[in-house]
């Protein structure tokens, strides 16, 4: 039975040209995290494997930095970066947990962080 929950940074906004940290946290389970995949709609951003380390997709390698922790730092933001991001936690023995973050990249300086929320 999957008992864990993913806590994410929720709906967030950031300024064009700036950077943002995408962060998820798995709680309420003793399952071992073997890998975390970061995805944006239909493409992979990065993988963090507990043994093999980080893999950054070529389309993001110039502006994605691993971490902090299992999170991902997205740099040099453009308006095209607006959209949904997913953290997929591969765990043993539970299986897969998925968290969702919505990022809005704004032209102006009115960007503020949204509230944190949980996905069961």
């Amino acid at each position: 039975m999957m008992t864990g929950t993913i806590e994410t940074t929720g709906n967030i906004s950031a300024e064009k040209g700036g950077s943002i940290i995408l962060q998820c946290h798995l709680s309420s389970t003793t399952a071992q995290v073997t890998q975390v995949n970061w995805e944006q709609q239909d493409q992979l951003l990065a993988i963090c494997n507990a043994d093999l380390g980080w893999h950054i997709s070529p389309s993001f390698k110039d502006r994605v930095a691993p971490g902090p922790g299992l999170g991902l730092t997205l740099q040099s933001l453009t308006v095209n970066d607006t959209g949904e991001y997913f953290c997929i936690y591969h765990t043993y023995p539970d299986g897969t947990y998925t968290g969702r973050i919505f990022l809005e990249v704004l032209e102006s300086s009115v960007a503020e962080h949204g509230a944190r929320f949980q996905i069961p």
């Epitope: 073997t34 995949n37 493409q43 992979l44 993988i47 043994d51 093999l52 380390g53 893999h55 591969h90």
Partner: antibody, heavy 115, light 107 residues
Framework: EVQLQQSGPELVKPGASVKISCKTS????????LHWVKQSHGKNLEWIGG????????NYNQKFKVKASLTIDKSSNTVYMELRSLSSEDSAVYYC????????WGQGTTLTVSS | DIVMTQSHKIMSTSLGDRVNITCKAS??????VAWYQQRPGQSPRLLIY???YRHTGVPDRFTGSGSGTDITFTISSVQTEDLAVYYC?????????FGGGTKLEIK
Amino acid sequence: EVQLQQSGPELVKPGASVKISCKTSGYTFSDYTLHWVKQSHGKNLEWIGGFNPNNGGTNYNQKFKVKASLTIDKSSNTVYMELRSLSSEDSAVYYCARNWAFDYWGQGTTLTVSS
Amino acid sequence: DIVMTQSHKIMSTSLGDRVNITCKASQHVSTAVAWYQQRPGQSPRLLIYSASYRHTGVPDRFTGSGSGTDITFTISSVQTEDLAVYYCQQYYTTPWTFGGGTKLEIK
């Protein structure tokens, strides 16, 4: 030029063990993961496991966890794979390969298990 | 484990033809897919990684597309040296797995 140079062919008896090597050159050893792949009957490819020279992490395909053991010698930029309790089913060509998508491959080591 | 299925074991083609080789994943693999070419007696050679990126030195007649569970590899105009076996592979999650291969041959 990136090169992965594997050890030569092996003929071993059932029940024995064998250790094959893959010496790397032409790049910074700790920057890329290294993997072993089995090819049986000149067709099917199977990932055995991989090694991260940067942190010493090893990830095995569960199917090969008992069969294979991966080690490295950082001083010579060489990775090794030991295969134990060999049977005829282990007869195959074994390749070492670099990176997540295997961008460079060794020439292959042919293992024949026969009495 | 994720199963990568290449439904065509053999594809017959003529020189100059356009060929699509498909690979279907049993689970979502996003764009964590590579394509390899293996000629007889040789080691596999990386052609495409991250579903659509050509490896260094690979001719532009080779392209890759797709995401999720349906991945496609295309040769826009088949040349004699392209006659080989082509494999897809996922590295979305371990254990990394390969398709069974598609042999490209002349009609």
